[in-house]
Amino acid sequence: LECYSCVQKADDGCSPNKMKTVKCAPGVDVCTEAVGAVETIHGQFSLAVRGCGSGLPGKNDRGLDLHGLLAFIQLQQCAQDRCNAKLNLTSRALDPAGNESAYPPNGVECYSCVGLSREACQGTSPPVVSCYNASDHVYKGCFDGNVTLTAANVTVSLPVRGCVQDEFCTRDGVTGPGFTLSGSCCQGSRCNSDLRNKTYFSPRIPPLVRLPPPEPTTVASTTSVTTSTSAPVRPTSTTKPMPAPTSQTPRQGVEHEASRDEEPRLTGGAAGHQDRSN
């Protein structure tokens, strides 16, 4: 069996002029093609792998959502010579005219890595973007993580940073066929320069509350005593708990998986999500 072979990071690697063909090992009777597209509110990019596969012919498409970061995965295996070039690998930035420029920034800024190499997405070197609220969702958190695609015995990975709907997620992730999108969220502008070592705290531990100093009981007292609690004190309010500092009580994110009836279109923003602001 002869299959196309290439590895694409963002928009480099599987361009038609750069395509290779490979002869598969004896016993390998499928060609494989996998594409994973990631869309932030500031742009979209894709990873792709083509080569000799394993298993049975067929298709597997999936749509995933990680706190407003959308991922679309297409995996296709086929049993004919050079049959693995059917998926469109093109990705492009979302057109700002229909998106962020039409909506006011919400005051939060995040580092953005959309299709950038690991070298270009280090520390404070990536571009800074202004977050905005889209599709009735508030994007006030910043994200730092990775997307990984594995197929045809090849693993390709790129960093992802941008604005998300969660400010406290820690080492959170979603998975699809041969695909993982994972990372952590944080609160505050430009807080996502490096969240690799972010520590997880259980959301069940309430925040520490510093009590005000008690009123003096006698006029003769010459020293003022400040009391702080040795054990956590729950907020007495029965409505929302007090917002916790990022470093103390990040809350665990929940994996969301959105099954999609239509096939994800990987050209110019993923299907159904071209304009994230409406």
């Epitope: 072979s5 963002a10 928009d11 480099d12 361009s15 038609p16 002029n17 750069k18 395509m19 290779k20 063909t21 490979v22 990019f45 050079r82 070039a85 469109n88 093109t90 990705s91 492009r92 930035a93 057109d95 299709g115 950038l116 050209t267 110019g268």
Partner: antibody, heavy 117, light 112 residues
Framework: EVQLLESGGGLVQPGGSLRLSCAAS????????MSWVRQAPGKGLEWVSY????????YYADSVKGRFTISRDNSKNTLYLQMNSLRAEDTAVYYC??????????WGQGTLVTVTS | QSVLTQPPSASGTPGQRVTISCTGS?????????VHWYQQLPGTAPKLLIY???QRPSGVPDRFSGSKSGTSASLAISGLRSEDEADYYC???????????FGGGTKLTVLG
């Protein structure tokens, strides 16, 4: 119908600059890799530069590296080639070419750049 | 000096079969990269003739065929016609140069 229309060629002195444009129509420009390919009079084809659909990946031939800059404006469906420090050996017809599903599937009619003193 | 080597000229009479070779190296054709062929009629822009070693775009007659083996590729034209008189170029990606490379071109003359 896919159309690529180059412009901006002309006569220029060695060391001078020119900016070529390629207006694209009939396809989704923002999804296509694009290239500039040149052909010196009576000679063969020589690839010059390559730009990805989003503009984030760019390649140059060694012969033009540091002197030429490829860019694109997806909102205007236009590809550009800024040519600085031009030399006599840059004299050629410059073609803009689209990379379709396979190879360079559409080419413009070309624009002539003549570098002479 | 082109990275891909083609004979500068080839000729044949109408109805004949003509083959044009394209020799590369381990950094292009030999690395597994697919080979494309372009036809350039006199005074016109190049046109894609064969892509992906042996595939024809729609509208290209089946008289044109391509093949690839090792570090070489070839273009065959059977049932030669006068309108086939043109320059033919092979092309492939090159790892060392990080870009597509062209052969020097072969001028095909249809005799008689």
């Amino acid at each position: 119908e896919v159309q690529l229309l180059e412009s901006g060629g002309g006569l220029v002195q060695p060391g001078g600059s020119l900016r070529l444009s390629c207006a694209a129509s009939g396809f989704t420009f923002s999804n296509a890799w694009m290239s500039w390919v040149r052909q010196a009079p009576g000679k063969g084809l020589e690839w010059v530069s390559y730009i990805s659909s989003s503009g984030s990946t760019i390649y140059y031939a060694d012969s033009v590296k540091g002197r030429f800059t490829i860019s694109r404006d997806n909102s205007k469906n236009t590809l550009y080639l800024q040519m600085n420090s031009l030399r006599a050996e840059d004299t050629a017809v410059y073609y803009c070419a689209r990379e379709g599903l396979w190879a360079f599937d559409y080419w413009g009619q070309g624009t002539l750049v003549t570098v002479t003193s | 000096q082109s990275v891909l080597t083609q004979p500068p000229s080839a000729s044949g009479t109408p109805g004949q079969r003509v083959t044009i070779s394209c020799t590369g190296s381990s950094s292009n054709i030999g690395a597994g990269y697919v080979v494309h062929w372009y036809q350039q009629l006199p005074g016109t822009a190049p046109k894609l003739l064969i892509y992906d070693n042996n595939q024809r775009p729609s509208g290209v007659p089946d008289r044109f065929s391509g093949s690839k083996s090792g570090t070489s590729a070839s273009l065959a034209i059977s049932g030669l016609r006068s309108e086939d008189e043109a320059d033919y170029y092979c092309a492939a990606w090159d790892d060392r140069l990080n870009g597509p490379v062209f052969g020097g071109g072969t001028k095909l003359t249809v005799l008689g």
